[in-house]
Amino acid sequence: TPLGPKWPEPVFGRLASPGFPGEYANDQERRWTLTAPPGYRLRLYFTHFDLELSHLCEYDFVKLSSGAKVLATLCGQESTDTERAPGKDTFYSLGSSLDITFRSDYSNEKPFTGFEAFYAAEDIDECQVAPGEAPTCDHHCHNHLGGFYCSCRAGYVLHRNKRTCSALCSGQVFTQRSGELSSPEYPRPYPKLSSCTYSISLEEGFSVILDFVESFDVETHPETLCPYDFLKIQTDREEHGPFCGKTLPHRIETKSNTVTITFVTDESGDHTGWKIHYTSTAQPCPYPMAPPNGHVSPVQAKYILKDSFSIFCETGYELLQGHLPLKSFTAVCQKDGSWDRPMPACSIVDCGPPDDLPSGRVEYITGPGVTTYKAVIQYSCEETFYTMKVNDGKYVCEADGFWTSSKGEKSLPVCEPVCGLSARTTGGRIYGGQKAKPGDFPWQVLILGGTTAAGALLYDNWVLTAAHAVYEQKHDASALDIRMGTLKRLSPHYTQAWSEAVFIHEGYTHDAGFDNDIALIKLNNKVVINSNITPICLPRKEAESFMRTDDIGTASGWGLTQRGFLARNLMYVDIPIVDHQKCTAAYEKPPYPRGSVTANMLCAGLESGGKDSCRGDSGGALVFLDSETERWFVGGIVSWGSMNCGEAGQYGVYTKVINYIPWIENIISDF
């Protein structure tokens, strides 16, 4: 009895022979048709079986069939060589229906009790297949109650037949100059029902070469050309193929920069497929010949489109394109077989003519005018009046294009004026004010600008003076008329200098005493040093030993003389240093305010008076001879004194220069 189409109830039940458990009658025929829902099968087993045994179960039997197939014909009680009894076997329908037929013939030799069987519907596991049978699904099979479904591995898609997995093998584009491509899963069998498209797309100018490698196995047919699976190669010029079978196709020189490879498979077959190694070629560029003193990298047998080379120069040579230096050079081969840039030169590094050395000269050691790599030059300073600072003056043209000293310095040496040279030597005893002779005080500077004052040359572009002497011109430095190299105040023969800037000590307060009475004038040009214009030295740390009480210093200037007029000729006076306490006491009496003499001052002069600096000498140097170096240095700056110059019991007061060395050095180095 077939069950209803909606399968509202579970399908199970019992079948038995007529009259069971009693004996069955003769000439009986009974048929049952069992139907399970789609995706289910029927399971049947016997709990009792007792039928007449006959050869091949010809007399009485139970026949089980599913569709057109007979599953079993059963009789007897136990199986024999030619007959089968069910015993403990379980029988399964092949599909969702099972037919059971019971038949007894016209007689029984003895009574038989027949059979009892039970059946039930159960899910078919479609994913289980017998050995040797084709799998239900290509890749993954998923069973569920009443059915199954297939799925595919990554890179595949389920075909519309719902069982086969087709490869997702289209749209791959190869843009490298060489590479490999193969059928999906190579060297394992390629997938069925797939259509693969591969593209090789190189820049215009390249030509693709295809080589089939390793093995080739694509389903073929003895009579028809590749009717099942095939490989085709298409360029913009021609089509190659179709290819199939087991023979490796020959090399294909496509003469094209774009190639499309199509591979199509059908639903059957088990073949390993193919593998292609592709390369490319192009019109070669001329072989690059390295310029002299250079080399090419990388070195290749040939250079084709997109290949490049660089030029590297030997040490001491630089890349030049025309006359312009290059940081690096790389040329690229173009599709027309030409290089994109002309070959550069490796030119010997030329440091160029060396810079002139102020107050010095340069000599070519390697050869006249030779300024190329490894050339040597020698700087020297003008003898007597200049000395070389920093290095020995020997410079070599190095690979970086710089003249470089043996210490590795790229800057010029410095010709520093020799300081403290004088034509005069001290006699050791005190003379009266005397006329200076040429070269006696070559550091002496005459400052005109409202009033007459003095200063002392430092280096070749600075003047040391008193703050009070230039205070009025601090904001108008150009108003200062600075003269040097002359003895006569009114002489038209002098070296003119102009001021660029005036630096007054920040601790100086005008019209409120003379503490910190010191100033520097920066000249707008360096002066040429000679026997009449020479800077004074600044005191060394050890200078105090030459400036003790009673040591002799020399003051010079064009200030007021005993006659009350400015001197026409430069005058000088040798005067001893006065004990500081003695000087302080001398200026503590009215009209001088208390504390007039500070630790930043030193005093010089005779207790008896008569020898002193005076108005017009302000800013000039009080100099001392350093007996160790045999050079004169500035110990004091003419600053102030008694209203009456050279008065007995009063002394000339000078700014103590040694206290201001850091201040002087800072300004000179900063400006």
Epitope: L320, Q321, G322, H323, L324, P325, K327, S328, S347
Partner: antibody, heavy 118, light 107 residues
Framework: QVTLKESGPVLVKPTETLTLTCTVS??????????VSWIRQPPGKALEWLAH???????SYRTSLKSRLTISKDTSKNQVVLTMTNMDPVDTATYYC??????????WGQGTLVTVSS | QPVLTQPPSVSVSPGQTASITCSGD??????AYWYQQKPGHSPVLVIY???KRPSGIPGRFSGSNSGNTATLTISGTQAMDEADYYC?????????FGTGTKVTVLA
């Protein structure tokens, strides 16, 4: 002492041709890896390279002005000449000549202001 | 013609460090040059071939160049460094100048 000095008209009418001369001293126009460049600077604007010529007579021009520019040198007079045709008010600028050495423009003239106006 | 881009202005306090950048495609593959121009004056070369200093240029000026950017650095900036600064490079055999940067030294 390297010096360069520009000379030429201070006023040019539109459509006219400008001729500028650069007189150099302190270096040779025929030897060494040196060149002379012309550069201009419109008022309040950036520097703009125009052309150069090297001792080897190798020349180069600003791409956008190539058709209007010509550079030449007279080694015997130590002069470099730049001509610029079809002048326009937008060409009003200070024109500098300068020396090129090792790729750097290391010495410049003081510049000459050229005004283009009718 | 390629473009070299500079910031229009840079402000710096005296004694501090000023950095001026110059950007251009693959500028690091080329040599960079830097010029200082004070009002009413001709430009002055302060750095050539990325990092070399012509004689007479103070040591506080330095340069570097890599990638797409060249940099001029003024360390311990002084009032006298207030000026316009231009970078320059060679493209093939044509010179290209930057847009210029005004450096202001704050009082």
């Amino acid at each position: 002492q390297v010096t360069l000095k520009e000379s030429g008209p201070v006023l040019v009418k539109p459509t006219e041709t400008l001729t500028l001369t650069c007189t150099v001293s302190g270096f040779s126009l025929s030897r060494g890896k040196m060149g002379v460049s012309w550069i201009r600077q419109p008022p309040g604007k950036a520097l703009e390279w125009l052309a150069h010529i090297f001792s080897s007579d190798e020349k180069s021009y600003r791409t956008s002005l190539k058709s209007r520019l010509t550079i030449s040198k007279d080694t015997s007079k130590n002069q470099v000449v730049l001509t610029m045709t079809n002048m326009d008010p937008v060409d009003t600028a200070t024109y500098y000549c300068a020396r090129i050495r090792r790729g750097g423009i290391d010495y410049w003239g003081q510049g000459t202001l050229v005004t283009v106006s009718s | 013609q390629p473009v070299l881009t500079q910031p229009p202005s840079v402000s710096v306090s005296p004694g501090q460090t000023a950095s001026i950048t110059c950007s251009g495609d693959k500028l690091g593959d080329k040599f960079a040059y830097w010029y200082q121009q004070k009002p009413g004056h001709s430009p002055v070369l302060v750095i050539y071939q990325d990092n070399k200093r012509p004689s007479g240029i103070p040591g506080r000026f330095s340069g570097s160049n890599s990638g797409n950017t060249a940099t001029l650095t003024i360390s311990g900036t002084q009032a006298m460094d207030e000026a316009d600064y231009y970078c320059q490079a060679w493209d093939s055999s044509t010179a290209v100048f930057g847009t210029g940067t005004k450096v202001t030294v704050l009082a």
